[in-house]
């Protein structure tokens, strides 16, 4: 019999510090660029080494970004949301959420988790 | 993944104008940032000019502006550089290059480490 799979979604208040070479991710997505079919949500796609993403260690590859600074990202062109990031200020505060991948195995077993890429 | 095949070098006399094309395989051509870097024998690769996903923003390397230009044909899958005014000095092999999204940085898609896809390069030589 084959396991279910399930997602746990969860939110979190990410605070970053501009380092010398930025941010240090890429993204994904907006209204002129769906990643995922019928969201327009920005995604992270890419996070560099030993930049500030990957240092701070809590923005993961797939995670969809809700805001920056407080400011919504819904319904924005892909070019718009990289102005954005890219004008957010030298301290950036990202609203992400994580998708966690569950799978529920066979009653009796238990789930086993791991992030999604 | 993507894969990219330059064409279009060849050898020019000075003055003349050059089209490279470069065709990428895969479905989701038109969510890549796009870029040319160009290497001199015995010289390090360099930022030629770079595409966003869309195509609305390009950028050039100092030494191109005005005289190149980028544009790409996300229906095509397929990425171009006009070289107009050829100089000797813009021999080289060329490289088509190729990373997902957008970096949210200011000149990050000028860097080489950047991008994660290269083609094998296509010679241009001006003489």
């Known amino acids: 019999m084959n396991g279910r799979v399930d997602y746990l979604v969860t939110e979190e208040e990410i605070n970053l510090t501009r380092g010398p070479s930025g941010l240090g991710f890429n993204i994904v997505g907006g209204t002129d660029q769906q990643y995922v079919s019928n969201d327009s949500g920005i995604y992270v796609s890419r996070i560099k080494e030993n930049g500030a993403a990957a240092l701070d260690g809590r923005l993961q590859e797939g995670d969809k970004i809700l805001s920056v600074n407080g400011q919504d990202l819904k319904n924005l062109l892909h070019q718009d949301a990289v102005d954005l990031f890219r004008n957010a200020g030298y301290a950036v505060s990202l609203r992400v959420q994580h998708r966690l991948q569950v799978q529920n195995g066979p009653i009796g077993h238990r789930g086993e988790g791991d992030p999604s890429g | 993944d993507v894969q990219l095949v330059e064409s279009g070098g060849r050898l020019v006399q000075a003055g003349d104008s050059l089209k490279l094309s470069c065709a990428a395989s895969?479905?989701?051509?038109?969510?890549?940032?796009m870029g040319w870097f160009r290497q001199a024998p015995g010289k390090e690769r360099e930022f030629v000019a770079g595409?966003?996903?869309?195509?609305?923003?390009?950028n050039y390397g100092d030494s191109v502006k005005g005289r190149f230009s980028i544009s790409r044909d996300n229906a095509r899958n397929t990425m171009y550089l006009q070289m107009n005014s050829l100089k000797p000095e813009d021999t080289a092999v060329y490289f088509c290059?190729?990373?997902?999204?957008?970096?949210?940085?200011?000149?990050?898609?000028?860097?080489?480490?950047?991008?994660?896809?290269w083609g094998q390069g296509t010679q241009v030589t001006v003489s």
């Open positions: 595409t966003s996903p869309s195509g609305d923003n390009r």
């Open positions: 290059a190729a990373f997902r999204g957008s970096c949210v940085d200011y000149g990050c898609d000028f860097r080489v480490s950047q991008y994660d896809y």
């Open positions: 895969g479905r989701t051509f038109s969510t890549y940032t």
